[in-house]
């Protein structure tokens, strides 16, 4: 007689990452009886929702339900029907919604209300939609990558699960770049964290971690570009902005109303004698880099050491995983290899930015022009942020690992978020939770 396979005893969880530029749905799966083990949860699906981030629906909230349909239906297909009612669904909104809330709490609440109503129509165990804090975003990203790298495991493995993994239990720092904010999170070496707002204490799997984190709102790649444009147009002599961060020959018309729509450009706002201006690319890495540096105020620091804008940053320690847009941009530019030095990255960026726009369009015919046009800026911004913002050096550059996935799961805050809210990261071996569930409602 043939042995019949026993039905696998697994659980599922869904997290929607409602970012500033788009929403992604992640489905996670784990063996039910190994819930408290480290490294057992893995991603089985990612579904990118078609359209912009949810904050853009403020004037068309009636469309939110349709917007979420495809990916929620995909989740319905992927997860066995018998598991639907037990599968928790969480939606976390990040800096795009933080910015909307700064402008109008009422409008942000309206969007979240309709998002919640829409998601509650699916047969899952919907646990709510909320705007997560920058501190949470940093913390959960750090938890995700270290969980996936096996850094919380008590048993030191003799094998390496990823090329850059070291066999020690030293945690990796987390560098996350979004469209509207960027996070830096790591365990400093015997350094007191001088600003309480940047300090997190965790007890995970029986070990204490004192973690530094900060989220720089408005310093995601998209908002940083808006900031740069708003800063540079102040000194333009007419409605033409010759911009070194765009390829030679590139032209784009920008509405001044769009430029000043975001709270991120408020500090540069001024009455301009025109309603529109034209960006004309000149493709010069060095000048672009200089322009970006003007976004970082390094003249003021009330601590022993700062990143920029008076924000405390301890000395960098250990290896770092750089994910989300850090990875996507560098991957596009073919600069994620461990062997590429910082000097080489800079050289390649100089060449890339100097390439004529027509040539770039031909070379990358399959890439949407809106995204394609911004890689010069984004790559330069990443270098500026890491080197001048966070004080990485040519030597410490080799400690930055550009990570897309670890063991098939995307690096990002969503897995850490779900692990916490489902109580799957025990403080002891294996008991209570690091960040209390009460932070949720």
């Amino acid at each position: 007689t043939q042995n019949k396979a026993l039905p696998e005893n697994v659980k599922y969880g869904i997290v929607l990452d409602a970012g500033s530029s788009h929403t992604s749905l992640y489905i996670y799966k784990w063996p039910a009886e190994k819930e408290n083990d480290t490294g057992v949860v893995h991603q089985v699906e990612e579904c990118r929702v078609k359209g912009p981030g949810i904050s853009k629906f403020v004037q068309k909230v009636n469309e939110i339900g349709i917007y979420l349909t495809d990916c929620m239906e995909r989740a319905r297909e992927v997860i066995p029907r018998s598991q639907h009612q037990e599968t928790p669904v969480y939606l976390g909104a990040t800096a795009g919604m933080r910015l909307l809330r700064m402008e109008s709490e009422e409008l942000a609440d309206r969007v979240l209300d309709v998002v919640e109503r829409s998601l509650s129509n699916y047969p899952f165990d919907f646990q709510g939609a909320r705007i997560i804090t920058g501190q949470e975003e940093g913390a959960y990203g750090w938890i995700t990558i270290n969980y996936l790298l096996g850094k919380f495991s008590q048993k030191t493995r003799w094998f390496s699960i990823v090329p850059y993994e070291t066999n020690n239990q030293e945690t990796f720092g987390a560098l996350d770049l979004g469209g509207a904010s960027t996070q830096v999170t790591f365990v400093p070496q015997n350094q007191t964290i001088e600003s309480p707002d940047n300090a997190l204490q965790f007890r995970l799997y029986g070990k204490d971690y004192n973690v530094y984190t900060h989220s720089f709102l408005c310093y995601g790649k998209d908002q940083a570009l808006w900031q740069k444009l708003a800063k540079d147009i102040q000194v333009a002599s007419n409605e033409i902005l010759r911009d070194p961060c765009f390829h030679p020959g590139y032209k784009k018309v920008v509405n001044v109303s769009d430029l000043y729509k975001t709270p991120c450009t408020k500090r540069f706002e001024m009455t301009l004698p025109f309603q529109q201006f034209e960006i004309q690319g000149i493709g010069n890495y060095q000048q672009c880099h200089q322009s970006i540096l003007e976004l970082f105020n390094t003249s003021y620091c009330p601590y022993s050491q700062c990143a920029f804008n008076g924000i405390f940053l301890p000395p960098l320690q250990g290896d770092f995983g750089a994910f989300s847009a850090f990875y996507f941009v560098m991957k596009f530019l073919n600069l994620t290899s461990e062997k590429v030095s910082q000097e080489k990255v800079t050289e390649m960026m100089k060449k890339f930015c100097a390439q004529p726009w027509e040539e770039i369009k031909t070379s990358y015919a399959g890439v949407k022009e809106k995204y394609l046009s911004e890689y010069c800026f984004s790559g330069t911004y990443i270098l500026s942020l890491l080197l001048q913002g966070y004080h990485f050096t040519a030597d410490s550059w080799e400690h930055i690992h550009f990570i897309g996935k670890i063991q098939g799961s995307d690096a990002g805050w969503t897995l850490g978020y779900m692990l916490n809210l489902t109580n799957m990261i025990p403080a002891e071996q294996p008991l209570s939770t690091p960040l209390s569930h009460s932070t949720y409602v």
């Epitope: 939110i64 309206r110 979240l112 109503r117 919907f126 409602v441």
Partner: antibody, heavy 121, light 107 residues
Framework: QVQLVQSGAEVKKPGSSVKVSCKAS????????ISWVRQAPGQGLEWMGS????????NYAQKFQGRVTITADESTSTAYMELSSLRSEDTAVYYC??????????????WGQGTMVTVSS | EIVLTQSPATLSLSPGERATLSCRAS??????LAWYQQKPGQAPRLLIY???NRATGIPARFSGSGSGTDFTLTISSLEPEDFAVYYC?????????FGGGTKVEIK
Amino acid sequence: QVQLVQSGAEVKKPGSSVKVSCKASGGTFSSYAISWVRQAPGQGLEWMGSIIPIFGTANYAQKFQGRVTITADESTSTAYMELSSLRSEDTAVYYCARESGGYRDHKLDVWGQGTMVTVSS
Amino acid sequence: EIVLTQSPATLSLSPGERATLSCRASQSVSSYLAWYQQKPGQAPRLLIYDASNRATGIPARFSGSGSGTDFTLTISSLEPEDFAVYYCQQSVFWPITFGGGTKVEIK
């Protein structure tokens, strides 16, 4: 002061549908959500679903998914609840109620007088 | 969904006595809990929202307390018109859910 006035009692046959209306007067209709709650004889309160008239966004309790449709007509300030494939256990008083909060605050501060729906062969 | 458990199911008291009604949630609902009063043949009426705030026109003898999972409705001194059924409702998670109700009857 907002008032919600519901349509009259109904007697229906099993398998048929019923559509109950709820007309708002004396206040803003569109921007507040309207919930529908039912109460079987001698039983507790059971939430069925809700709609925000201005957006047309409706959401339903899983138990009623596919059988209940909630709509709203902004021009007449009226919300409707239609329940199909009626069975005897659907015999209940059906209430409409205004949700006075918003995101994460679905308290029901104004209630209609209720509509008795009897399902009997 | 959030399950709300009310206790006791029935409370037999005399006018002038203090009534204490309990509502327990299956998971934290923060302070998003409302209390309703329902008399025979009438629609429910909102008494308390956000765990402790009295709705418009509700007498001061009604008070609510609690947060997270445990909530209490207190009627400091029962009036004859207070004998009714009381329901708690969590107003934060979908679907909206109600407790099974507590009947306050005359002893």
